[in-house]
Interface confidence: low
């Protein structure tokens, strides 16, 4: 259904408030360094133009594509070359190359100051003084730091952010009411950003087929009562939504997501019995709720998979006639029977099945050749099961902080070339798998753990892609999306690594560490731990533990001292010397 004016179409579908918010997100995700005021000005200009097109779709320029309109607007920024360097060259290109060029310059780790949370009273005053600007600033700050954040979901976060301030700024104890809510939004927001980043990486690096396979597996687990044709339709629509959002087409994405939610709710009887509550909510909450809905119960008496996919004499005929459809059916049937498997495991099984059929359907006796294909699945299933069991035992024994430290050491030894901040960030997140997943019963552990690890390892991959330093990371990140985790698990100590020169400055600490939050203090200690391993990759657990225990005691002692700075200077020298001796440096 072609519209004379795409911008008018989207403005009418989404409404002015959502239109403005989504354009702001889009611009902030493209031009991540531009000041807030500049973006607001651009958004207002686009909005005014959109209104003229709503009034008269035949007006000048109203027939232009959204990419053309938005790109032209971004290219009016006067400081583009000084601020963004070669990104300014994008403006010399025509659409669609110009948009592709902007997409390639999105920065997963922009050089922006850390967001510091002001005092509660200061925030409440700002909220009351100008609620609209306050909420726009939230969208802007999140979008520029997370250039792939799922835009319609960010509108949902902004709605919750507004609700938190509306409620808590009237409360007797504003801080007690507001701070936990903001912490929750921050943590959920980081998780949401990372999950969406994996979806975009899947689409951009491995293609639509890889994303669709992921979606078939996940939706089949979630909606096991839905028929294959229904799941296929949802997968097609969901792929369109995420392709649009990952491609910067945020207005189309939000519009299509709303349509998909509407379709799901209108057809919930043939999709899932768990959707009723979600479908009673307003649009943003509804879409979020559907995305997070629990798995429906599996239909009773599902027949054995072997009948259709191993025992049948028509396997090769069915495969040859429509390979992707047949493999999609295999994945659907396997996934709906296995909510206890991770999506990536299901995809590995499907890949193994595909590989076997490719080989066997060309063999003299295909049936004999693929008869034992399900036997090949056993080690693939056992590998993540064993890994999760071992790591949950370790987590329960150590607790989260020490478990993170064990992973820090493990990953620094595997890929010591990776920057220390990246190793700390990624290992801390990997370590959170313990508290997130190990509490679950066996049947929920693997989907929780391995699919979460896929998200975290993707963070490592996108950060490493910006500044590649390790061939091993590149190999694990680029060879196979579903085998990233096993690839990293299989890495041993990098024997080719030349230890870093010892630099006492790295291990010099000051009194400011005493005023840090517990989390920030942990990060300081974990940064030191990574550096230690980089200096002495062959250090034993016992040696590292001894040095870290000394370090903890040193910080505790100096933070209690009257003259903290002198204590840090003098005791620090002793600690460095003792650590060097302990590690044989």
């Amino acid at each position: 259904d072609a519209h004379k004016s795409e911008v008018a179409h989207r403005f009418k579908d989404l409404g002015e408030e959502n239109f403005k918010a989504l354009v702001l997100i889009a611009f902030a995700q493209y031009l991540q360094q531009c000041p807030f005021e500049d973006h607001v000005k651009l958004v207002n200009e686009v909005t005014e133009f959109a209104k003229t097109c709503v009034a008269d779709e035949s007006a000048e320029n109203c027939d232009k594509s959204l990419h053309t309109l938005f790109g032209d607007k971004l290219c009016t920024v006067a400081t583009l070359r000084e601020t963004y360097g070669e990104m300014a060259d994008c403006c010399a290109k025509q659409e669609p190359e110009r948009n592709e060029c902007f997409l390639q310059h999105k920065d997963d780790n922009p050089n922006l100051p850390r967001l510091v949370r002001p005092e509660v009273d200061v925030m409440c005053t700002a909220f009351h003084d100008n609620e609209e600007t306050f909420l726009k600033k939230y969208l802007y700050e999140i979008a520029r730091r997370h250039p792939y954040f799922y835009a319609p979901e960010l509108l949902f976060f902004a709605k919750r952010y507004k609700a938190a301030f509306t409620e808590c700024c009237q409360a007797a104890d504003k801080a007690a009411c507001l701070l936990p809510k903001l912490d929750e939004l921050r943590d959920e927001g980081k998780a949401s950003s990372a999950k969406q980043r994996l979806k975009c990486a899947s689409l951009q690096k491995f293609g639509e087929r890889a994303f669709k396979a992921w979606a078939v597996a996940r939706l089949s687990q979630r909606f096991p009562k839905a028929e294959f044709a229904e799941v296929s339709k949802l997968v097609t629509d969901l792929t369109k939504v995420h392709t649009e959002c990952c491609h910067g087409d945020l207005l189309e994405c939000a519009d299509d997501r709303a349509d998909l939610a509407k379709y799901i709710c209108e057809n919930q009887d043939s999709i899932s019995s768990k959707l009723k509550e979600c479908c009673e909510k307003p649009l943003l909450e509804k879409s979020h709720c559907i995305a997070e809905v629990e798995n429906d119960e599996m239909p009773a008496d599902l027949p054995s998979l072997a009948a259709d996919f191993v025992e049948s004499k028509d396997v090769c005929k069915n495969y040859a006639e429509a390979k992707d459809v047949f493999l999609g059916m295999f994945l659907y049937e396997y996934a709906r029977r296995h909510p206890d498997y991770s999506v990536v495991l299901l995809l590995r099984l499907a890949k193994t099945y595909e590989t076997t059929l490719e080989k066997c359907c060309a063999a003299a006796d295909p049936h004999e050749c693929y008869a034992k294909v399900f036997d090949e699945f056993k080690p693939l299933v056992e590998e993540p099961q064993n890994l999760i069991k071992q790591n949950c035992e370790l987590f329960e024994q150590l607790g989260e902080y020490k478990f993170q430290n064990a992973l820090l050491v493990r990953y620094t030894k595997k890929v010591p070339q990776v920057s220390t901040p990246t190793l700390v960030e990624v290992s801390r997140n990997l370590g959170k798998v313990g508290s997130k997943c190990c509490k679950h019963p066996e049947a929920k552990r693997m989907p929780c753990a391995e699919d979460y690890l896929s998200v975290v390892l993707n963070q490592l991959c996108v950060l490493h892609e910006k500044t590649p330093v390790s061939d091993r990371v590149t190999k694990c990140c680029t060879e196979s999306l579903v085998n990233r985790r096993p690839c990293f698990s299989a890495l041993e100590v990098d024997e080719t690594y030349v230890p870093k020169e010892f630099n006492a400055e790295t291990f010099t600490f000051h009194a400011d560490i005493c005023t840090l939050s517990e989390k920030e203090r942990q990060i300081k200690k974990q940064t030191a731990l990574v550096e230690l391993v980089k200096h002495k990759p062959k250090a034993t657990k016992e040696q590292l533990k001894a040095v870290m225990d000394d370090f903890a005691a040193f910080v505790e002692k100096c933070c209690k001292a009257d003259d903290k700075e002198t204590c840090f200077a003098e005791e620090g020298k002793k600690l460095v010397a003792a650590s060097q001796a302990a590690l044989g440096l």
Epitope: K351, T352, P379, E383, C487
Partner: antibody
Framework: EVQLVESGGGLVQPGGSLRLSCAVS????????MTWVRQAPGKGLEWIGT?????NTNYANWAKGRFTISKDSTTVYLQMNSLRAEDTAVYYC????????????????WGQGTLVTVSS | DIVMTQSPSTLSASVGDRVTITCQAS??????LAWYQQKPGKAPKLLIY???TVASGVPSRFKGSGSGTEFTLTISSLQPDDFATYYC????????????FGGGTKVEIK
């Protein structure tokens, strides 16, 4: 120590059979695919076949029917039947990819090879 | 089946020379290509995998490049230990021939 040791080579008459063994140590066959490769005197490398972690086999077209790969917990075997003079070669076993790669991978670890001579 | 064509079959060079060996696949294999070095009477040794990734313990003078059907192994400055035969190998499990080796390139002293 991670290593592969081939054995079972020797002189065999045309039309005869031979079974080569590849003993592995330092890793588990349930986690790695194993491949047999041969090299005729003065010639290049030639892939024979591969056995996956689950025991499925994949052969070069020329090897199908005469060559069979199997394994137990620590050893990989190559059964060669109806041998011909042109099968004279050094036979190597090599370790392929980690279990979770459904695809084939590079051969990162090789045995020292065992010589098979087919002659009357 | 995939056929790997390696050239040249023999190459005469001196210590310090920059040496280039090429390998052509009969159909696209993405980046699924490995390079091996073999010395007389010894087993092959993995040098490069995934077209450009240098294997553990291999000197940095060895460099792999290419994707699709055209691949290159470059030795930036030939050392005495580098005189050997080099093989390329595709590994594509989706084809009926999982592994296909090139014919080899013998690098000898000029």
């Amino acid at each position: 120590e991670v290593q592969l040791v081939e054995s079972g080579g020797g002189l065999v008459q045309p039309g005869g059979s031979l079974r080569l063994s590849c003993a592995v140590s330092g890793f588990s066959l349930s986690r790695y695919a194993m491949t047999w490769v041969r090299q005729a005197p003065g010639k290049g490398l030639e892939w024979i076949g591969t056995i996956t972690t689950g025991g499925n086999t994949n052969y070069a077209n020329w090897a199908k029917g005469r060559f069979t790969i199997s394994k137990d917990s620590t050893t990989v075997y190559l059964q060669m039947n109806s041998l011909r003079a042109e099968d004279t070669a050094v036979y190597y076993c090599a370790r392929g990819g980690y279990v979770s790669y459904a695809d084939a991978t590079e051969l990162s670890l090789w045995g020292q090879g065992t010589l098979v001579t087919v002659s009357s | 089946d995939i056929v790997m064509t390696q050239s040249p079959s023999t190459l005469s060079a001196s210590v310090g020379d920059r040496v280039t060996i090429t390998c052509q696949a009969s159909q696209s294999i993405g980046s699924r290509l490995a390079w091996y070095q073999q010395k007389p009477g010894k087993a092959p040794k993995l040098l490069i995998y995934y077209a450009s990734t240098v294997a553990s313990g291999v000197p940095s003078r060895f460099k792999g490049s290419g994707s699709g059907t055209e691949f290159t192994l470059t030795i930036s400055s030939l050392q005495p230990d580098d005189f050997a035969t080099y093989y390329c190998q595709s590994y594509d499990y989706s084809s009926s021939s999982s592994y296909a080796f090139g014919g080899g390139t013998k690098v000898e002293i000029k």
